[in-house]
């Protein structure tokens, strides 16, 4: 079961339906995006792999006071199967590699929306 | 309430495209997801795709390359397009909601009837 | 995809019987089952979702029940407006799949 908290689920819900509510999520952040996202804030990129989602967290949780990432955080802590904080790094960052927030988003967004397709939703 | 009223030609001629839409009353096409779903004469349900409230989609893969489902959003509407029909797509077709969050539909229109023949 | 298997394909009740439905699915789907009510020339009904969860208004003579591949939808006490068609559906994931429906009729 996949069972996001807070402002993100009503409760448990089949993680296809998790998936495709992050996706959404970041369509929103993306079609609504006017000044920079996160003040041109840089994340580390990461690579798209098995464990993507805590790796994803880990990179976003850095970023603070950006209200528009918020539910996005949120969700991706859903997927996670462990508690992720700040300054918290796994293997899966390509640590040489800062990018800003919103081409974070979009190559997440991009990559989702493959493996929604895919029918890859655990 | 929301309600859904699905129109569009009743009769399709074999290799051209089958164009349907669905009106939503009641609610807003830019909340939720608004989906297409068949049904084949005397037989079960088939699902065909989603338009989510951003206007993403989501198309079964057995149809995704003959599929195109857009939105209306001046006319809270969204339309079915299925290209280079058969008589297999001969089916009534339904548009429905599905709530976010969820997975099962809540809301159905009463069903337009398609025929495919020359 | 994940198929679902319904049984009986048809049957035959009285007024007043409990009648029993199943449905198998291919793989593990949790609870992840909703079952619909279909009269003919209209559109299906939603009757239960979460596998066990009835929905706003429906009677509370029809329950579902299982979780993992085995799922049954219960009505315990058949009434005149219940001879229809029940499809139940997958939402574990995408594409969504339905049953091949179970047709109940009058005996």
């Known amino acids: 079961l996949t069972c996001l908290g807070g402002f993100a689920s009503p409760g448990p819900v089949p993680p296809s339906t998790a998936l495709r509510e992050l996706i959404e999520e970041l369509v929103n952040i993306t079609q609504n995006q006017k000044a920079p996202l996160c003040n041109g804030s840089m994340v580390w990129s990461i690579n798209l792999t098995a464990g993507m989602y805590c790796a994803a967290l880990e990179s976003l949780i850095n970023v603070s006071g950006c209200s528009a990432i918020e539910k996005t955080q949120r969700m991706l802590s859903g997927f996670c199967p462990h508690k992720v904080s700040a300054g918290q790094f796994s293997s899966l960052h390509v640590r040489d590699t800062k990018i800003e927030v919103a081409q974070f988003v979009k190559d997440l967004l991009l990559h989702l929306k493959k493996l929604f397709r895919e029918g890859q939703f655990n | 309430e929301v309600q859904l009223q699905e129109s569009g030609p009743g009769l399709v001629k074999p290799s051209e495209t089958l164009s349907l839409t669905c009106t939503v009353s009641?609610?807003?096409?830019?909340?939720?997801?608004w989906n297409w779903i068949r049904q084949p004469p005397g037989k079960g349900l088939e699902y065909i795709g989603y338009?989510?409230?951003?206007?993403?989609?989501y198309y079964n893969p057995s149809l995704k390359s003959r599929v195109t489902i857009s939105r209306d959003t001046s006319k809270n509407q969204f339309s079915l397009k299925l290209s280079s029909v058969t008589a297999a797509d001969t089916a009534v077709y339904y548009c429905?909601?599905?709530?976010?969050?969820?997975?099962?539909?809540?809301?159905w229109g009463q069903g337009t009837t398609v025929t495919v023949s020359s | 995809d994940i198929q679902m298997t319904q049984s009986p394909s048809s049957l035959s009740a009285s007024v007043g019987d409990r009648v029993t439905i199943t449905c198998h699915a291919s793989?593990?789907?949790?609870?992840?089952l909703s079952w619909y009510q279909q009269k003919p020339g209209k559109a299906p009904k939603l009757l239960i979702y979460k596998a066990s969860d009835l929905h706003t208004g429906v009677p509370s003579r029809f329950s579902g029940s299982g979780s993992g591949t085995d799922f049954t939808l219960t009505i315990s006490s058949l009434q005149p407006e219940d001879f229809a068609t029940y499809y139940c559906?997958?939402?574990?994931?995408?594409?969504?799949?339905f049953g091949g429906g179970t047709k109940v009729e009058i005996k």
């Open positions: 338009i989510s409230y951003n206007g993403n989609t």
């Open positions: 793989q593990n789907i949790n609870v992840w």
């Open positions: 429905a909601r599905l709530a976010k969050w969820t997975w099962y539909f809540d809301i």
């Open positions: 559906q997958q939402g574990q994931s995408y594409p969504y799949t």
């Open positions: 009641g609610g807003s096409i830019s909340s939720d997801y």
